[in-house]
Interface confidence: low
């Protein structure tokens, strides 16, 4: 595996993306771990939801979040309020049983943020606060994500919404058909359950989908 470098600015958020083959890693949970030394173990930082179908839900461990677009095949890790000690070698992993496949090796580098102390949080160059009144600054790092903030919904969420919409249409059609034929609608078959209460419930009955 080649190592991909992601650079972030101290005090801001860094988003790390790990693309993978969504078919090959179908049904597998993912994890983000920190490499301890060149030959040391990879220490788990955060992993996706225990229910694979809920992998799109962002999970936090301290200032690190993970979310998985299982259909699009992109694992996204957010390191919020990046600190100098966050720099180092990490791995995106795909879990199966007690084994883990490396999806991507990531080197996180933390660049100094010599901007205004009041806004920047952890500044690695405290002498810089007065020096940047007139300096030209190019910001290539996106703004920090708030903890409750949800980015653009991944493919899996869109699919679930489509599922809900489709099931409701089917249920309405069945009710309409029953009414048209003058029959009393009986108990709903499983296919008509409203998956809005548990977005993963309906899809969990599909073959091959299980939490590993």
């Amino acid at each position: 595996h080649n190592t991909t470098v992601f650079q972030g600015v101290a005090g801001q958020s860094l988003q790390v993306s790990c693309p993978y083959d969504s078919m090959k890693h179908w049904g597998r949970r993912k994890a983000w771990c920190r490499q301890l030394g060149e030959k040391g173990p990879c220490q788990r930082v955060v992993s996706t939801h225990n229910l694979w179908l809920l992998s799109f839900l962002r999970r936090w461990n301290g200032s690190t979040a993970i979310t998985d677009d299982t259909l699009g095949g992109t694992l996204t890790i957010t390191l919020r309020n990046l600190q100098p000690h966050d720099a180092g070698l990490y791995q995106c992993q795909s879990l199966h049983g007690s084994e883990a496949d490396t999806l991507r090796k990531v080197l996180v580098e933390v660049l100094a943020d010599p901007l205004d102390h009041r806004d920047a949080g952890d500044l690695w160059f405290p002498g810089e606060s007065e020096s940047f009144e007139d300096a030209h600054v190019e910001h290539s790092i996106s703004r920090s994500l708030l903890e409750g903030e949800i980015p653009f919904p991944p493919t899996s969420i869109l699919l679930l919404l489509a599922c809900i919409f489709l099931i409701k249409i089917l249920a309405a059609s069945a009710l309409w058909a029953a009414a048209w034929h003058g029959q009393k609608p009986g108990t709903h078959p499983p296919s008509e359950l409203d998956c809005g209460h548990d977005p993963g419930y309906q899809l969990q009955t599909l073959p091959g989908l299980r939490d590993t």
Partner: antibody
């Protein structure tokens, strides 16, 4: 491997000018703050100034002791750092080093060049 | 400018001895927002350029032997060599990077008996 190599030193008369160069290799030059430091024989180093990285517009910071006489610049296409020294005085005689501020290093200088000797004398 | 008072100016020790070098700054080098102290230690062997030993007051630079330890916070800092080796013969300098201009201590010359 990170390497910094200074050149351009030598003997210059008081009141004269000199330009020092520092060739950088082994790292992404535009990502780093670059510094000049000098050290008179038998004395402690003296920080002269720095030039910031691409993200911060390659702006400069100087020690008041040399501000107005010394100018730091960089050529990012050639991975070169420069120190232009004007109106040189005898007290500017020293070994001059270029050095890099490391990422995550709190402003400290993680790599230095071998240094180049500048002698200001008539 | 922040003034750095480094002591002692010189030390003569035997191999295996423990050595401590002190640096005191004229103002605190602890930046509360990052909870970091902005002090570095350098080693300069005769005829060579300075090499970074310790940054952020206590973080050992890559490849630096663990007999070198940096400690302290605020205005008082210490470099400790737990068991001096022959190759440690050098000048040692501390440097503050809390505010411009960055300033160095006058240095400590470590000699072996």
């Amino acid at each position: 491997e990170v390497k910094l190599l200074e050149s351009g030193g030598g003997l210059v008369q008081p009141g004269g000018s000199m330009r020092l160069s520092c060739a950088a290799s082994g790292f992404t030059f535009t990502d780093f703050y670059m510094n000049w430091i000098r050290q008179p024989a038998g004395k402690a180093p003296e920080w002269l100034g720095l030039i910031r990285n691409k993200a911060y517009g390659y702006t400069t910071e100087y020690n008041p002791s040399v501000k107005g006489r010394f100018t730091i610049s960089r050529d990012n296409t050639q991975d070169m750092l420069y120190l232009q020294m004007n109106t040189l005085r005898a007290e500017d005689t020293a070994t001059y080093y270029c050095a890099r501020i490391g990422i995550n290093y709190g402003g400290s200088l993680d790599y230095w060049g071998q240094g180049v000797m500048v002698t200001v004398s008539s | 400018d922040i003034l750095i008072n480094q002591s002692p100016a010189s030390l003569t020790v035997s191999a295996g001895e423990k050595v401590t070098v002190s640096c005191k700054s004229s103002q605190s080098l602890l930046y509360s927002e990052s909870n970091q102290d902005y002090l570095a230690w350098y080693q300069q062997k005769p005829g060579q350029f300075p090499k970074l030993l310790i940054y952020g007051a206590s973080y050992r630079h890559t490849g630096v032997p663990d007999r070198f330890t940096g400690s302290g916070s605020g205005t008082d800092f210490t470099l400790t060599i737990s068991s001096v080796q022959a190759e440690d013969l050098a000048h040692y300098y501390c440097e503050q990077t809390y505010s411009y201009p960055y300033t160095f201590g006058a240095g400590t010359k470590l000699e072996l008996k």
